[in-house]
Interface confidence: low
């Protein structure tokens, strides 16, 4: 197409030789005339500039827009395309001229002593060795060395074209150091120039940007982006960057090769883009493309440019976190900001440091949350540049599934005397408090193991049918009291009690407490016996070093073979939801004890004495009696608790006080200890004696001084003593005012 003029107005230049191909002999003269409709120019082989001395281009004598090209004594190297064209257009006429020079059948380029061919080892690629011919129909082969190999055209992938050269798959000659073309004419061999073979790679393994993501800056900061291309050996790389503000004044690009370890099968190239002071217009996508000619790989990253440093909380930041005891708690500090803020966590105002139980970083992690972790956690974000602070409070509430206190305290196998009224208790600790505590029951015989069955510790009662206590038909008459709330060991607990009006039937009772995070249950074996009865002499709960006797009384006409046992440790612990094994069915866990037998008119009494009871004597004691007729064993279990000896302590302080004459003073002195201590009062180190005005009550715990007089002023001491020592507290009572004189007549 013509440039600047409509193409329809111009015909192609007309050549005097109307052929596509012209073959002439060497040493003859080549002359071609070209006529057209505008200014014309010629181009010919080996000299595109028109400065060749041998070639002559002249204006025709017979007309405008006509030029003749003349080459006297042509040689093989004059072979090629001769083009006549209109200036400044693409309109041209071409003739290809072969100058047959049998002494020099290959066209040599003017300057080359040897050529270079670049190849890749790609199986699908072919390479052209540019050994052009001055004769069109030569018989040409390609020689490669070393070792010497010859390749001949095969009509398929190996071919020779006089205008193009020798074409061959590149991998076939990748071993060679050099190649050349050879033509046979009348048994003479003619060689082209040598071509050095250079194997170039093309594979790019990857292109990596660093930083790869999350790049944030504020206006005026420096951006440095590194683009690394990893390639196979013998690869050259061109880098090309695309970025938002191409006209940037302060942009700098540096490309360099990186050294790799010797023997490495890989090359590395690095391109670094630097913008010294970014502006908002530099925000956007940055793309680095690495090209090896045959392959291009690229990678991109987004650069965010902020107007100025800032910090703010993200809207996913929790204000309330709820967890259950034992869980791992994660509270992430969700923020928006640049640069990333410094993060500091506080609990109830105290800084948190990381340790094996807690990690205080971008995410506050509590490995195994417990009740004491409940509280307010403050996270403070500080922008490291502007020092701007943002704070946020997260309330952590730790929930506790119901735990039933008596499970670990009371024997799971207590026995109860027929006809008695009994109270069963479940003390539940849970956060939040249980939304219900339900009681269930079932008959013992429906659940107890048959003698033939092996006792399974994990499921000793093969029964599932628990009945609501409202349905007490066939069982004991029951009443469930309203739940009470009590502060026990500093914890708010819910106490549920079930009253059995008359113990007539052996049964199992289960209390089940449920709150929002779980459930807890306790199974009570309520074994009713008409048989033996256990009593403790002299006290239900002896203190260590005191003596205690356990009495087992049984009707002599009904029972025989009274024996005392102590229940040993369970062979396996009883897990939540499992039922205790009936004690008479499993004597393996019992230790037989020495005891003394007494009798009266109706009963046998088996007495087991513990002299100087110790804490090791605590546990479950079993009295076993055998029915004289049926030989069935009856067991009664009593849990013995031995109280630890504790030296006296006085809780609370006596306060110094000032009182006016005629008023009253009331003070309290509460002492604890085991055995319980005796309380004594002293005034000015002398024993305080009760009289009409001085009253001691509640085992001397409370002291009242009525209508105080000036002489009641002084140092008062409360002293609590037991065999384990004494404790005392003191206070000074000041009496103000003048003593009234009274007349005694």
């Amino acid at each position: 197409a013509s440039v600047g003029l409509p193409s329809v107005s111009l015909d192609l230049p007309r050549l005097s030789i109307q052929k596509d191909i012209l073959t002439i002999k060497a040493n003859t003269t080549l002359q071609i005339t070209c006529r057209g409709q505008r200014d014309l120019d010629w181009l010919w082989p080996n000299n595109q500039s028109g400065s060749e001395q041998r070639v002559e281009v002249t204006e025709c004598s017979d007309g405008l827009f006509c030029k003749t090209l003349t080459i006297p004594k042509v040689i093989g190297n004059d072979t090629g395309a001769y083009k006549c064209f209109y200036r400044e257009t693409d309109l041209a006429s071409v003739i290809y001229v072969y100058v047959q020079d049998y002494r020099s059948p290959f066209i040599a380029s003017v300057s080359d002593q040897h050529g270079v061919v670049y190849i890749t080892e790609n199986k699908n690629k072919t390479v052209v060795i540019p050994c052009l011919g001055s004769i069109s129909n030569l018989n040409v082969s390609l020689c490669a060395r070393y070792p010497e190999k010859r390749f001949v055209p095969d009509g398929n992938r190996i071919s020779w074209d006089s205008k193009k050269g020798f074409t061959i798959p590149s991998y076939m000659i990748s071993y060679a150091g050099m190649v050349f073309c050879e033509a046979k004419i009348n048994d003479e061999s003619y060689q082209s120039i040598m071509y050095i073979v250079v194997v170039v790679g093309y594979r790019i393994y990857d292109v990596v940007l660093s930083p790869s993501h999350g790049i944030e800056l504020s206006v005026g900061e420096k951006l440095v982006l590194n683009c690394t291309a990893r390639t196979e050996l013998n690869v050259g790389i061109d880098f090309n960057w695309e970025y938002p503000s191409s006209k940037h004044q302060h942009k700098k690009l540096v490309n360099r090769d990186l050294k790799t370890q010797s023997g490495s099968e890989m090359k590395k190239f690095l391109s670094t883009l630097t913008i010294d002071g970014v502006t908002r217009s530099d925000q956007g996508l940055y793309t680095c493309a690495a090209s090896s000619g045959l392959m291009t790989k690229k990678n991109s990253t987004f650069v965010r440019v902020h107007e100025k440093p800032f910090v703010a909380f993200g809207s996913g930041m929790e204000s309330l976190v709820e967890a259950t005891v034992g869980e791992r708690v994660r509270i992430p500090a969700k923020y928006l900001g640049y640069p990333p803020p410094e993060i500091k966590w506080y609990k109830n105002g105290i800084p948190l440091e990381s340790n094996h139980t807690i990690k205080a970083g971008h995410v506050l992690t509590i490995m195994e949350v417990s009740e004491r972790d409940t509280g307010n956690y403050t996270v403070i974000l500080t922008n490291p540049i502007s020092k701007e602070k943002q704070s946020h409070v997260v309330s952590l509430v730790v929930y506790v599934p119901p735990q039933i206190g008596e499970k670990s305290l009371i024997s799971p196998v207590d026995s109860y005397q027929y006809g008695t009224t009994q109270t069963l208790t479940c003390t539940v600790y849970a956060i939040p408090p249980p939304h219900h505590i339900h009681w269930y029951w079932q008959l013992e015989e429906e659940c107890a193991n048959e003698p033939s069955q092996a006792v399974s510790v994990t499921n000793p009662y093969p029964c599932e049918e628990w009945r609501s206590v409202e349905d007490f038909q066939g069982g004991n008459k029951i009443e469930v009291n309203k739940n009470q709330f009590a502060l026990i060991e500093g914890k708010n607990k819910t106490v549920s009690t079930l009253v059995i009006q008359a113990a007539n039937v052996s049964a199992l009772y289960k209390c089940e407490a449920v709150n929002k995070v779980g459930r807890g249950e306790r199974v009570i074996s309520f074994h009713v016996t008409r048989g033996p009865e256990i009593t403790l002499q002299p006290d239900m709960q002896p203190t260590e070093q005191e003596s205690v006797s356990l009495w087992c009384t049984a009707d002599r006409s009904t029972f025989e073979n009274l024996t005392w046992y102590k229940l040993g440790p369970q062979p396996l612990p009883i897990h939540v939801g499992e039922l205790p094994t009936p004690v008479c069915k499993n004597l393996d866990t019992l230790w037989k004890l020495n005891a003394t037998m007494f009798s009266n008119s109706t009963n046998d009494i088996l007495i087991m004495e513990l002299k100087n009871a110790s804490l090791q004597d605590q546990g479950d004691y079993v009295c076993l009696a055998q029915d004289r007729k049926t030989k069935k064993r009856h067991c009664v279990v009593r849990q013995l608790t031995v109280l630890e000896r504790v030296a006296p302590t006085i809780t609370g302080n006596l306060e110094n006080q000032t009182t006016s004459i005629g008023e009253s003073i009331e003070v309290s002195c509460t002492a604890s200890g085991n055995p319980p201590p005796q309380i004594m009062w002293f005034k000015d180190n002398e024993t305080l004696v009760e009289d009409s005005g001085i009253v001691l009550k509640d085992g001397n715990r409370n002291l009242t001084i009525r209508r105080v007089r000036k002489e009641d002023e002084g140092l008062y001491t409360c002293q609590a003593c037991s065999v384990l020592g004494c404790a005392k507290v003191e206070a000074f009572f000041i009496i103000e005012g003048a003593q009234e004189k009274t007349n005694l007549e």
Epitope: F310, S315, G316, S319
Partner: antibody, heavy 119, light 112 residues
Framework: CQSLEESGGDLVKPGTSLTLTCTAS?????????MYWVRQAPGKGLEWIGC???????TYYTSWAKDRFTISKPSSTTVTLQMTSLTAADTATYFC????????????WGPGTLVTVSS | AVVLTQTTSSVSADVGGTVTIKCQAS??????LAWYQQKPGQPPKLLIY???DLASGVPSRFSGSGFGTEFTLTISDLECADAATYHC??????????????FGGGTEVVVK
Amino acid sequence: CQSLEESGGDLVKPGTSLTLTCTASGFSFSARHFMYWVRQAPGKGLEWIGCIDIGSGSTYYTSWAKDRFTISKPSSTTVTLQMTSLTAADTATYFCARSSGYPYYFTLWGPGTLVTVSS
Amino acid sequence: AVVLTQTTSSVSADVGGTVTIKCQASENIYSLLAWYQQKPGQPPKLLIYSASDLASGVPSRFSGSGFGTEFTLTISDLECADAATYHCQSYYYSGSSADTGAFGGGTEVVVK
């Protein structure tokens, strides 16, 4: 092609309850997503109701929505808005929208579903 | 809680002209602001986020600016198709979930 569609809009009487469902097509919710409910009374502006953090399951509500509106995620492609004690003031087109991670602008919206509360 | 105010409820301009819509925040919200376009019977469509970043597929005729409390949406070379209501939305969060999704009241653009 990723899209959201709300359903469940209806004419209901004051004091009743209604549940709207937002169904995702062409994608499943991922931990990076937050799903939102926004409403628009006829001729009025947009009003943010609340959202659910798909990653943690945490829900967030605007102050007036706390007591009567509940957002939940029954499946990996549905989010619901449960509304109770409806009044005429709740008459609006209800949209569900999605944001991906931070920050919380809404990149995908459903076409909306109309809820009319009238006796 | 952040309150966004779009003082102008309606603005009109000629085809080919330029229109500017303002949005004011009751407190510093940095650049945490988005703009949406809403046509009748359709859901809103995100135009701008981070106060000035163009959402994908949005023509460069739309631009956003501002930081802190004052924000502006500019539409140049106005086309008929730009007739719609434009809403601003803050996604700044200062500690109460009620802050999370404040919207402005909306500004209607009428193209003559």
